[in-house]
Structure formats: C-alpha cells, structure tokens
C-alpha cells in the first residue's frame, strides 16, 4: 500500500517517528475543529454578528469573528436568507467572506428586476471557501444590505459554519 | 505537539486506553458514514422520496428518511432543481430540512416576479446543515411546491447527501 | 466499540493485519487529497479553464481537468458568479459538472425574465457532488454562457474545489 509521505500522511517509516507508534499516532490527522453559528437576532451593521451559543469546537467566537485555534485547511460555508420588500429599482444582494478583514470571496445576486411591484421577494445566497488558516486567523461576513436578512421569520436560516479538513501539525 | 484531549481526539496518554495501542486505535475517529441519494422519479407529496439504490454507507434509508446508524457530527446538504411554468403571480419555492420531523433549516426563493409571462423559469436551491445526530435520528426534506421539481428532465439534479465529520464514540 | 469491518474502517482484529499495528496504521484512512482552483482570467470556450497555481494536493490539473491520483469518495463543489447584461429575452444559465466527459450533474437558473430592461443582473450558481472516483478520473466544468462569467470584476468568485472524504485503499 503506497502512501506518499506528504505532510498530511502518516510517516510510517523514517522521519522523526520511525517505529515509535505513539509518535506516529500523535502525527496522525486526528484533530477536528468545527463551528456552526446562527446569525444574531438584532443586526445593526454590515459586519454580521452571530449567536455564540451555537456549535463551537476548537474555534473561538469574538466580536463577530470566528477565530482559528488550530492551523490547517478549513472548509468554510455561509448561507443567508433574504426577504426584500421590492423598491422601484432592482436590488443587488451581496455576501462577503472576509479572512483577517480582507475580502476573500463574495457572492452577488440581483432581485426585484426593475419595475416589478411584488409584495416581497425571497432570495437565498451561499458562499464557500477552502483555505489554509493559521492560528488567530479571523473569519467574518459582511452584507451591505443586512436590513434584508430576516432574522425574525428565519432565525435558523442564516449561518456561518467551518470545519477543519486537514491539520498542519 | 499539543493535541487537546477532547472527545474527538485520541487520548495518547492516560484515559481508559493509556499505552494500549489497539485501544487507542479503536478510539480514533476512523469511522466514516455517508449517503448520496437522488430524488425518486414520481413525487406525490410534499415530503420527498429518494432512490434507495444510491450511495449509502453506514446510513439507512426508510420511507423518505435517512436514518442515522452511528452518532456524531454530520454535514448534510440538499440541492434541488426547479422548473416552473410561470402563472400570473410570483411563486415562492421552499426547501425544508427536517431532523426527526422538526424543521431544522429552510431556504426560500421567489421566481416568476409578477406579470412575467415566460414559458418556463429554472431555479436551483440548496441547503446545508452541520449538526450532532444520534442513532435513529431521521433526516427528511419537505417541498410545498414539489410539482415544480422536474424529476424527468433532471433526474440527477435533486439530491440529498450527508457525511459524518466526527464520530462521538 | 462496534466498528463494522467495512473497507473504510480499520480491521482491528483479523483480516490481513491482525495485531500488526504498523499494518493497521497503513490501512487507516489518513490519506488526504484536495484542490481549490479559481477560474482562469481569460475564458474562450465553454469548458472552463482554471488557474493551476491554486491549492492542489494529491490531485493534478491538466487542460481544464482536475485529475484524480488517489481512488476514493470525493466531495466536489463548484461555484460561479455571473454578470448578465440582459437582452430582450430571458437567459438560462447552466453549470455542468462532467466526470470523464460525461454529464454527472447540472444546475440551471433563469435570469432576465422576459421584457426586463435592467442594466445588469448578478447571479450565483453552485453545484456539488459526492462520488467514488478512480485514479485518472477527470473532473471538468462546462458553462454554455461562459461570456457571462465575470472574471475581471470577480476573479476570486469562480471556483472548483474537491476533497477526498474516504480513501479506498
């Protein structure tokens, strides 16, 4: 069974561990970190806040940020549910994923195409990322049109979630 | 190498296992469970049915439900492809993810904004969840407007999928 | 602890390994493979090209294809950001995921509902797949309306990503 001796594989022979099985086990990618947070009830700025009583394991939450505690490759996904009372003109909904306050990825969708007088329009927007993150890296979400995120009707629908895919020990 | 001794990490020293390496291996998060099911050809109710000849490993399928066999933290994702023959009014498409018959998360999108007489409108809707699930937990999907899920032209596009991220043995 | 002796679980007793701990470790699902590629700046055909200087680990990139190097169950996800200058008629945006040049899954959404003269419409489309892939399997993405993928305004938004969930050694 040929397992290439890359950083994420167990060095079964040689390396620092050689035949030391406890050492081998220590080097194995057993570590798991994850988070699943729902948006806070009352939003008052473009940077979204989250309920810190969600699922948090090996990750911290602080001031609207998820803060990484273990380095590695993370899968990050955010999903938002919008409810727009259509004005006269079209509306561009935008979701920005920020890493250390820098925009890493965004998703945009246009609703209320011009002239449409509908009572309301629902729109769902999601965004994902697969990225190496270091300790103390912050993850946050920005939404210009945060007033359209319906936290009362849909308190469970707006979430930010991450999980560690491969640790870099 | 500081690996915190949390439930999902291998207790390399102490605990029940101590230096017993077979025990340590048993406690390691090797278990994998997953499913990837396509929607059934003929839908006749709001609770969607699935083709049980899809990918199923460590998960059971029964009466429209995925049934958990191993406890742990699961990533759940559902994606649906809609085809709507627009009526005079707008249509709200809704996808509900249910855990043990309780709505856990939903996604909504409005199509056919009022007055638009188009032959047809395509819409794609997805929903994800990261959650701890116990043995015998059921996962199901509800769609009020199931008649708009085009299972004939797009039989492969409507799927429910899960995978175990971290087991809780 | 009852771990079923299936291909993705470690046979803690019996099998080829029995009590041989190094063998057991070799059989454990430690292998990790992943990719996260952004779309190439200049698109000139319906089969999308990707920046090969993205994240690639245990996967090759060649001629618009991700090429699998280790067999197993992969999670595949693609997300595209469209910007459409609306013509007189509606536009169907389609994203196809191809495995070995066969259509495996597609996502469609209609924008610019008839008669709407908007300056521009944003739309975001994603598609995922969980599938067993063999060595040398190719993964590619096809978009008929590739001219609407805005690679200049949104160079980071259009991505193809995969990760190995369970290897089949």
């Amino acid at each position: 069974d040929s397992i290439p001796n890359s950083p994420d594989n167990v060095p079964l022979k040689g390396g620092d561990c050689s035949e030391d099985l406890l050492c081998i086990l220590k080097r194995a990618p057993f570590k798991k970190s994850w988070a699943y947070l729902q948006v806070a009830k009352h939003l008052d700025k473009t940077k979204l806040s989250w309920n810190k009583d969600g699922i948090l394991h090996g990750v911290r939450y602080q001031d609207g940020n998820l803060v990484i505690q273990f380095p590695g490759l993370y899968f990050i996904i955010c999903q938002l549910q919008f409810l727009v009372q259509c004005p006269q003109n079209s509306v561009d909904l935008k979701l920005e994923l920020l890493i250390n306050k820098h925009i890493k990825k965004q998703a945009l969708v246009t609703v209320c195409e011009s002239g449409m007088q509908t009572k309301h329009v629902y729109q769902n927007l999601s965004q994902f990322l697969l990225d190496y993150l270091q300790v103390d890296t912050t993850i946050s979400v920005n939404v210009d049109t945060f007033q359209y995120i319906d936290t009362s009707t849909f308190p469970l629908e707006n979430v930010l979630s991450i999980f560690l895919y491969s640790n870099s020990d | 190498d500081s690996i915190p001794n949390s439930p999902d990490n291998v207790p390399l020293k102490g605990g029940d296992c101590s230096e017993d390496l077979l025990c340590i291996l048993k406690r390691a998060p090797f278990k994998k469970s997953w499913a990837y099911l396509q929607v059934a050809k003929h839908l006749d109710k709001t609770k969607l049915s699935w083709n049980k000849d899809g990918i199923l490993h460590g998960v059971r399928y029964q009466d429209g439900n995925l049934v958990i066999q191993f406890p742990g933290l699961y990533f759940i994702i559902c994606q649906l492809q809609f085809l709507v023959q627009c009526p005079q009014n707008s249509v709200d498409l809704k996808l509900e993810l249910l855990i043990n018959k309780h709505i856990k998360k939903q996604a909504l999108v409005t199509v056919c904004e009022s007055g638009m007489q188009t032959k047809h409108v395509y819409q794609n809707l997805s929903q994800f969840l990261l959650d701890y699930l116990q043995v015998d937990t059921t996962i199901s999907v509800n769609v009020d407007t199931f008649q708009y899920i085009d299972t004939s032209t797009f039989p492969l596009e409507n799927v429910l999928s899960i995978f175990l991220y971290s087991n809780s043995d | 602890d009852s771990i079923p002796n299936s291909p993705d679980n470690v046979p803690l007793k019996g099998g080829d390994c029995s009590e041989d701990l190094l063998c057991i470790l070799k059989r454990a699902p430690f292998k990790k493979s992943w990719a996260y590629l952004q779309v190439a700046k200049h698109l000139d055909k319906t089969k999308l090209s990707w920046n090969k200087d993205g994240i690639l680990h245990g996967v090759r990139y060649q001629d618009g294809n991700l090429v699998i190097q280790f067999p197993g169950l992969y999670f595949i996800i693609c997300q595209l950001q469209f910007l459409v200058q609306c013509p007189q008629n509606s536009v169907d945006l389609k994203l196809e995921l191809l495995i070995n040049k066969h259509i495996k899954k597609q996502a469609l959404v209609t924008v610019c509902e008839s008669g709407m003269q908007t300056k521009h419409v944003y739309q975001n489309l994603s598609q995922f797949l969980l599938d067993y892939l063999q060595v040398d399997t190719t993964i590619s993405v096809n978009v008929d309306t590739f001219q609407y993928i805005d690679t200049s305004t949104f160079p980071l938004e259009n991505v193809l990503s995969i990760f190995l969930y369970s290897n089949s050694d």
């Epitope: - | 085809l83 023959q85 032959k119 047809h120 085009d150 004939s152 032209t153 797009f154 039989p155 492969l156 | 055909k45 319906t46 089969k47 389609k94 196809e96 191809l98 495995i99 070995n100 040049k101 066969h102 259509i103 495996k104 096809n142 978009v143 008929d144």
Partner: antibody, heavy 124, light 110 residues
Framework: QVQLQESGPGLVKPSETLSLTCTVS????????WTWIRQPAGKGLEWIGR???????NYNPSLKSRVTMSVDTSKNQFSLKLSSVTAADTAVYYC??????????????????WGQGTTVTVSS | QSALTQPASVSGSPGQSITISCTGT?????????VSWYQQHPDKAPKLMIF???NRPSGVSNRFSGSNSGNTASLTISGLQAEDEADYYC??????????FGGGTKLTVL
C-alpha cells in the same frame, strides 16, 4: 415496437408557417426527447430541435427564432411549426425519438427510432 | 452552430477496414463523450450505429466501432461488406444542449 408517422401538408407557400405532426404508436411518449431532423434533397442531415414530455425544448440556434415545438401526451403526438419559410426550407422532415437516461450519470443513447420522413416543398 | 467536418467520400474493398473521421470543436466533440454515428441507405431513414463514441445498439454488427480523441471522433468499419455501402453521419451533443450533425460521408465498397 415503437413507430413514428409524420403528417402535414407537402406544400407550403413562402413566408407562411410549416406545420407537421408526429404520431407515436406502439409505445409511450413519456420519458423521451422527441426530435425533428430535416434533409434537403442530396444534402446532409440538419438537427432542428427536440422537446421533452415536460415541455422543455432545445432548438438549433440558426432556426431558433422561427421554430416552435409542442407535445400532446394525451394524443401521443408532438408537433413542429416553422414560420416564415423560404425555398431553403424545402426538405424531407423526419420525426425521431432520442433516448436519454439519467442513472449514475447522463447516458445519451442517440436517436434510435425514426419516422420514414415526409417531403415538404416550399413554393408559391 | 457549424456542422461537424467529415470527408465527402471514402472507399474500400470487401474485407478491408475503413475509417471515417468527424472533426468538431471544444464545445461538442471535444467536450463530451456523446458522439453518435448513423447509417443511411438511399431513400431510407437513418439508422443508429454507434452511440456515446463507442457503444453499439443491439443488432448492430461488431464490425462497427468508434473512438474519440481531442476534437475528432472516428468510425471504423472492419471486414467491409457490400451492404455497408451507404452515407454515414456523425452527430455530437453540444454545450448548448443541442445536437449537430456532420456533413456526411459516402462510403463506396469497390
């Protein structure tokens, strides 16, 4: 054994609309794509378009502005309308069945059943 | 959409093998493994001979085989017989969910 039979006028005046119907017998019209293909005398085949029983259509881009297809599952029939015809539309018109199966992936089995063809002449 | 390119004619003697090429673009033949081949005798409807590049419908002789490389597909007929004399058309699925035919190749059995 599925059989297809084209019907419609053999002569159409320029600028008018060509209308053809295909009747499916010996099998169900459901779960297939139904296709129209034409062949001018002494020339090659030209794909016009297809319709699924759900009503989804795909048309040849060069003919799209003039083509309309419809399906009537209750009568086991599907139809072609081609507007603003000219002499260049003179051809043998075939209706045909295309089989596509979605299983582990999409399998395209090609056009496996054909009608015998009907000649349409565009002339004043 | 432009027609796929086929040679106007090919010929071969009984028992020989011949190959007909079909060249398309990166949006049809080069994109998918969805290429079909049809045989048409004079005053008859076409008949499906190959689907998905190299698969034969039941009832079609195994003397007919297909392949695909890059933007070009090929039909090979081995052990040529008199009844193989006909017109042959390739067809490919395209990125716009349509089909496109080749211009056709007249096969003459000498």
């Amino acid at each position: 054994q599925v059989q297809l039979q084209e019907s419609g006028p053999g002569l159409v005046k320029p600028s008018e609309t060509l209308s053809l119907t295909c009747t499916v017998s010996g099998g169900s019209i459901s779960s297939y794509y139904w296709t129209w293909i034409r062949q001018p005398a002494g020339k090659g085949l030209e794909w016009i378009g297809r319709i699924y029983t759900s009503g989804i259509t795909n048309y040849n881009p060069s003919l799209k502005s003039r083509v309309t297809m419809s399906v009537d599952t209750s009568k086991n029939q599907f139809s072609l309308k081609l507007s603003s015809v000219t002499a260049a539309d003179t051809a043998v018109y075939y209706c045909a069945r295309e089989r596509v199966v979605g299983a582990s992936r999409y399998y395209y089995y090609g056009v496996d059943v054909w009608g015998q063809g009907t000649t349409v002449t565009v002339s004043s | 959409q432009s027609a796929l390119t086929q040679p106007a004619s090919v010929s071969g003697s009984p028992g020989q093998s011949i190959t007909i090429s079909c060249t398309g673009t990166s949006s049809d033949v080069g994109l998918y493994n969805y290429v079909s081949w049809y045989q048409q005798h004079p005053d008859k409807a076409p008949k499906l001979m190959i689907f998905e590049v190299n698969n034969r419908p039941s009832g079609v002789s195994n003397r007919f085989s297909g392949s695909n490389s890059g933007n070009t597909a090929s039909l090979t007929i081995s052990g040529l017989q008199a009844e193989d004399e006909a017109d042959y058309y390739c067809s490919s699925y395209t990125s716009s969910s349509t089909w496109v035919f080749g211009g056709g190749t007249k096969l003459t059995v000498l």
